[in-house]
Structures are given as structure tokens and as C-alpha cells.
């Protein structure tokens, strides 16, 4: 008799995940030799531990704590990039600008980057089938609190001039709801982190407006500002031709605005 | 088993670019970071960069940073590495190189080799 | 960079010979060393990992020691096939860095 199993909204455990995480570990010490003292098979039992043989829907950041320990690692607390909603540029800047640091460019985030996993309650199966949606389902799910909990991290982590990079193409600029919004925010240190600088993103090749001055933009100036933490925006226009002048900061058309 | 298939031989022009071809097969190609490294005639072998093929991401020796471009197609599991403005001083087998995640990380695997020659 | 430099550049020896090579890296790399061998026109073959591990498939008679700046490949009782080109490597940080080579020839 097959066994009855809970079907979540959300897609199931990405295929080959324990192969994908160990891997994904050792090729993560072999390119920054400063954490080759990471043992990969530790990491991934502490991975494994957060989530396996617990309820989907019942993750605390309590669960991640082994994984947090053997995961430390310290990037440069004033070169720190976050980003909301427009991953991919954010990853093709720090790809280029090398001292500078996404969540994802750090062993934790690398790990997990574009993953899902959860198991089942009273099992030690992986639930291949379907996970939790944070909508539908449950906020308390294993991805969702593994992202709350670095991301948090991340946060409190960074100081002096913070960057996020913003989509301006979104209808929300800023959303509260985002990890940026409800959780990197509220965790930025105000006794050392002194700016908060948004580079907000355009998508049209013909948009020249101040996003800026966008209602969510202003929202997030206040948020910040009542952090007692200081607050900047700078528009960038083009974005084929932002990465470009980071490659080549000397090129004569990296003067201009973009 | 685990192979790695490069390109043929190349003769190029001093001046021009040579792309070199590394096909991954009996792995998981992202699985693995990619390295290139070249030998010249009687030479000793020299390492040229690396790319995590998952992502795309690269890095280079300083001495071919502005020549040099590592690329990949995941659905090919082939890795690329271009070189430009070529001179004589180029003329070397090029290799493609993965460690066993097994072995440290000495390159316990390696391609057959592409000889680029380069002629004025 | 780290500079790794091998001693000696040439070696001659005959079958049955205990043959040591050296290599010196320009600082402290702790274990990260590999040993590889070349036959001409082949592509490197690692014989030894972390300064002291032996490669799959490599025999016995292949050794390597040493550990920060110091190592050696010993080759306890050279066999024919043994003759070629070895080349240390260091991959304790970027860029991964090569010895010259030593090349060992039948005496």
C-alpha cells in the first residue's frame, strides 16, 4: 500500500539536490582557497539535519544553526551588494567587480542559490514531489527560513556604504515583502552601517525618469532614515553600459551618466 | 566513463583569436569547475583560469586577464576558451583540466590536448 | 604568485634506481601540492595529492612528503616507464602555480 503523502503547492525538492549541495561545497572551497577548511560532507549533514524528519511547515532558524556554525565566513562588511528582484545583474556586477559581495557569493548562499528541498515529518525521505509554498502553504518552510536566516545574517554583517541594487522596472521598486524588504532592511546595524545606497535599475532603452523619486523608493528612504542610517539613489540608465564601464572604468564614454 | 574531447590543432595568424573546445561526458558537467592550461614547446605548463560551468562565473591568471575568455554551454557540457590577439609566444598545446573532488584539487583529469599554432 | 622551483631540472638513473626530486615553493603552501608525470605529446597525469596521497591507479613505488615549503616525489625502485618529465604543482591559492619540470632520463 503506497504510503500517503502531503501534497504542498509549491515544486518539489530540485532534482539531484544532496549531489547538487556537496558539489556545489566542494566547488566553492576549490575557488576561494580561504575556506578550504570547510569539510563538504559536514556541511552537508548539518544541511540535511535542518530539514529532514521535520514537518515542512515547522522550520525555525533554530534548524539552520548547525549549518550557520559551519558556514562562517567574513567578506568585507563595507563591500556588501544586496539586491531585490533583479538577481541576474547584481551576479554579472560582482562577476566583474570582484571585491564586492552578493549573498550568493558567499558559501551559504552559493549552496542554496536557485534550490528547493523539504522533507516529511517522521521520515528521513527527501519530498521529491512537492514543497510548501510560502503563499499557499506556509511560511515556516525549510527555503524560507534558510533565506530569512542568512539573509539576516548578511544584514547585520554589513557596514559603512551599503549596496542594493533595485529593478526599476517592477511596479513595486521597493516591496516591503521582498527578503530585502522585510528582512535585510530591519537588519542593517545603525551603529555601523552609515549609508544605504539604492541603484535602481531601468529596463526601456528610452526611459529617462527619476525612479528616484518613486513613491516605493521614497517609502524605503523613510524606512531607512527612521534607522537613523543615511540614505542614497542613483538611477542607472543603462545597465549593458554600467557593467561595461565597471570592466572598463578608463573607456571615455564611462564619464556621461548611466 | 569520464572523458574530456577537445578541438583539433589550429594553425592561426599573429593578431587573430582561436577558440578552443573542451567536451565534458560520464559527469555532471556543472559538478565541476573547469581550469585551461597551456604548455608551450619544451616549456613547463601554466595555468590560465578556471569557470564554474552552473554559472558562468570565471577567473583568470593576471598575465592573460585582457586575452583571454573562458566560456561554456551547459547543454553541450562543452567548455570554451578563447585566445586573442595572438603571437608567436601563444604557440602551445592547450589543455582543459577537472580535479576528482577526490584527489585535493590536483587535476586528476585532463583532455588530449589542442596544439595552436601561431604563424606571422 | 607562488614560485615553485624543482631540483634537479635533469636527472639521469637507471631501472631499479631510487630517484628523489625536490621542489621548493617561495612560501608556505602547506599540503596543497600535486605531483603529475608527462610522457611527450600526453597530457599530465597526477601521480600524487596533497603533498603525500596517491592518485588512483599509480603504484606503489610513487611517493610524495613534505609539508609548508619542502617536497619530494621519491620513485623507490625506477621502473622503464618511469622516464619522463615530473612537474610539481601548488593549488593553495590563485594562480595555481608549476615547478620548470624535471626531466628523468635512462642513465
Known amino acids: 500500500v503506497p504510503r500517503w503523502r502531503q501534497q504542498w503547492s509549491g515544486p518539489g525538492t530540485t532534482k539531484r539536490f544532496p549531489e547538487t549541495v556537496l558539489a556545489r561545497c566542494v566547488k566553492y572551497t576549490e575557488i576561494h582557497p580561504e575556506m578550504r577548511h570547510v569539510d563538504c560532507q559536514s556541511v552537508w549533514d548539518a544541511f540535511k539535519g535542518a530539514f529532514i524528519s521535520k514537518h515542512p511547515c515547522n522550520i525555525t532558524e533554530e534548524d539552520y544553526q548547525p549549518l550557520m556554525k559551519l558556514g562562517t565566513q567574513t567578506v568585507p562588511c563595507n563591500k556588501i551588494l544586496l539586491w531585490s528582484r533583479i538577481k541576474d545583474l547584481a551576479h554579472q556586477f560582482t562577476q566583474v567587480q570582484r571585491d564586492m559581495f552578493t549573498l550568493e557569493d558567499t558559501l551559504l548562499g552559493y549552496l542554496a542559490d536557485d534550490l528547493t528541498w523539504c522533507g516529511e515529518f517522521n521520515t528521513s525521505k527527501i519530498n521529491y514531489q512537492s514543497c510548501p509554498d510560502w503563499r499557499k502553504d506556509c511560511s515556516n518552510n525549510p527555503v524560507s527560513v534558510f533565506w530569512k536566516t542568512v539573509s539576516r545574517r548578511f544584514a547585520e554583517a554589513a557596514c559603512d556604504v551599503v549596496h542594493v541594487m533595485l529593478n526599476g522596472s517592477r511596479s513595486k521598486i521597493f516591496d516591503k515583502n521582498s527578503t530585502f524588504g522585510s528582512v535585510e532592511v530591519h537588519n542593517l546595524q545603525p551603529e555601523k552601517v552609515q549609508t544605504l545606497e539604492a541603484w535602481v535599475i531601468h529596463g526601456g532603452r528610452e526611459d529617462s525618469r527619476d525612479l528616484c523619486q518613486d513613491p516605493t523608493i521614497k517609502e524605503l528612504e523613510s524606512i531607512i532614515s527612521k534607522r537613523n542610517i543615511q540614505f542614497s539613489c542613483k538611477n542607472i540608465y543603462r545597465p549593458d553600459k554600467f557593467l561595461q564601464c565597471v570592466k572598463n572604468p578608463e573607456d571615455s564614454s564611462c564619464t556621461s551618466e548611466i | 566513463q569520464m572523458q574530456l574531447v577537445q578541438s583539433g590543432a589550429e594553425v592561426k595568424k599573429t593578431g587573430s583569436s582561436v577558440k578552443v573546445s573542451c567536451k565534458a561526458s560520464?559527469?555532471?558537467?556543472?559538478?565541476?569547475?573547469m581550469h585551461w592550461v597551456r604548455q608551450a614547446p619544451g616549456q613547463a605548463l601554466e595555468w590560465m583560469g578556471w569557470?564554474?560551468?552552473?554559472?558562468?562565473?570565471?577567473d583568470y591568471a593576471q598575465k592573460f586577464q585582457d586575452r583571454v575568455t573562458i566560456t561554456r554551454d551547459r547543454s553541450m557540457s562543452t567548455a570554451y576558451m578563447e585566445l586573442s590577439s595572438l603571437r608567436s609566444e601563444d604557440t602551445a598545446m592547450y589543455y582543459c583540466?577537472?580535479?576528482?573532488?577526490?584527489?585535493?584539487?590536483?587535476?586528476?583529469?585532463w583532455g588530449q590536448g589542442t596544439l595552436v599554432t601561431v604563424s606571422s | 604568485d607562488i614560485q615553485l622551483t624543482q631540483s634537479p631540472s635533469f636527472l639521469s638513473a637507471s631501472v631499479g634506481d631510487r630517484v628523489t626530486i625536490t621542489c621548493r615553493a617561495s612560501?608556505?603552501?602547506?599540503?596543497?601540492l600535486a605531483w603529475y608525470q608527462q610522457k611527450p605529446g600526453k597530457a599530465p597525469k597526477l601521480l600524487i595529492y596533497?603533498?603525500?596521497s596517491l592518485a588512483d591507479g599509480v603504484p606503489s613505488r610513487f611517493s610524495g612528503s613534505g609539508s609548508g615549503t619542502e617536497f619530494t616525489l621519491t620513485i623507490s625502485s625506477l621502473q622503464p616507464e618511469d622516464f619522463a618529465t615530473y612537474y610539481c604543482?601548488?593549488?593553495?591559492?590563485?594562480?595555481?602555480?608549476f615547478g620548470q619540470g624535471t626531466k628523468l632520463e635512462i642513465k
Open positions: 583540466a577537472r580535479s576528482a573532488h577526490t584527489t585535493g584539487f590536483g587535476f586528476a583529469y
Open positions: 560520464g559527469y555532471t558537467f556543472t559538478d565541476y569547475i
Open positions: 569557470i564554474d560551468p552552473e554559472y558562468g562565473r570565471t
Open positions: 612560501e608556505d603552501i602547506y599540503s596543497n
Open positions: 596533497d603533498a603525500n
Open positions: 604543482q601548488q593549488y593553495n591559492n590563485y594562480p595555481y602555480t
